[in-house]
Amino acid sequence: ESALITQQDLAPQQRAAPQQKRSSPSEGLCPPGHHISEDGRDCISCKYGQDYSTHWNDLLFCLRCTRCDSGEVELSPCTTTRNTVCQCEEGTFREEDSPEMCRKCRTGCPRGMVKVGDCTPWSDIECVHKESGTKHSGEVPAVEETVTSSPGTPASPCSLSG
């Protein structure tokens, strides 16, 4: 199943929550790292490394931990209160419109353009026209037109889901 559910997707009704941890729900909610039991009378802990919950909630199950795909590196592991944080490997990036896969960064800009931004895990290299300074559309140029450059190093991690 390609659809990724996060607790934000499932939690339209955010309610102010009490601060102390309890084994039974407080005001009908269970703390992060737990889900509510079928009868609504207990809070059941999520399984470390398998599932998680990030907010006070009345979900009847915890959310599955994301597994990083090949081509991704794991920046931080899944805990009972936080999903795995995955990041594209060096030289690749993830676009907002195609978040399901890491794409290779271009190796250079087309002729007549200069590189103003490095490859990061969340963006391709950025090219602008020498004269006008306007950005290039992002089409991959023909090989003979490219001016080679090395991929940049990641500046900061990008989180895929809450």
């Epitope: 009704q13 009908g28 609504g40 009847l60």
Partner: antibody, heavy 122, light 112 residues
């Protein structure tokens, strides 16, 4: 719009099994529980259990545990209810019905299938 | 299991007149979280049940405001302020406070 379309009527012999399907459309299939409820002729409604398409968990009414198996095919957004060791008292209309993943709003069914009549007769 | 008892079994009413259906549970339906999980469905002839009211008094989307629910503890009521022809069918109450969830036996509303 949300639609739950069930398979056609079935006639079965005592001791046999029946498998009823429920095809969902108009919403994210993995975003809701799929419940099964039955209604015997002239009788009330009886909740049998529910399936969680997100993680594959099942939760059954103890009365049916061991005799009912709930499954889904996520690729076709279809839920299935299989009832085994059929007896005449299992003659009923079987409904699939959707409910939310939250305790506070998960105990009522906002959309129902049209029902599938299962007749158990020798 | 919690037993849900509905009265009357059958309710003949005149068009435009009010109607009232009672539902009584064998145990309190007040959950430890303070909420009461009592719901009402209408099953029109030849159709599947449709949700009318959830959690005692909340009308489901598209349900006319002539339908209202009330009650607490073990005693609950569904009221129709002015019965219309399309309101004919069997009304069921159900509870989800206690597992397994259970339904009442139904009340058949018909036009006199």
């Amino acid at each position: 719009q949300v639609q739950l379309v069930q398979s056609g009527a079935e006639v079965k012999k005592p001791g046999a099994s029946v498998k009823v399907s429920c095809k969902a459309s108009g919403y994210s299939f993995i975003g809701y529980f799929m419940n099964w409820v039955r209604q015997a002729p002239g009788m009330g409604l009886e909740w049998m259990g529910r399936f969680n398409p997100y993680n594959g968990d099942t939760f059954y009414n103890q009365k049916f545990k061991g005799r009912v198996t709930l499954t889904v095919d996520k690729s076709t957004s279809t839920a299935y209810m299989e009832l085994s060791s059929l007896r005449s008292e299992d003659t009923a209309v079987y409904y699939c019905a959707r409910s939310a993943y939250y305790f506070d709003s998960g105990g009522y069914f906002d959309y129902w299938g049209q029902g599938t009549l299962v007749t158990v007769s020798s | 299991d919690v037993v849900m008892t509905q009265t009357p079994l059958s309710l003949p009413v005149s068009l435009g007149e009010p109607a009232s259906i009672s539902c009584r549970s064998s145990q309190s339906l007040v959950h430890s979280n303070g909420n009461t999980y009592l719901h009402w469905y209408l099953q029109k002839p030849g159709q599947s049940p449709k949700l009318l009211i959830y959690k005692v008094s909340n009308r489901f989307s598209g349900v006319p405001d002539r339908f209202s629910g009330s009650g607490s503890g073990t005693d609950f009521t569904l009221k129709i302020s002015r019965v219309e022809a399309e309101d004919v069918g069997v009304y069921f109450c159900s509870q989800s406070t206690h597992v397994p969830w259970t339904f009442g036996g139904g009340t058949k509303v018909e036009i006199k």
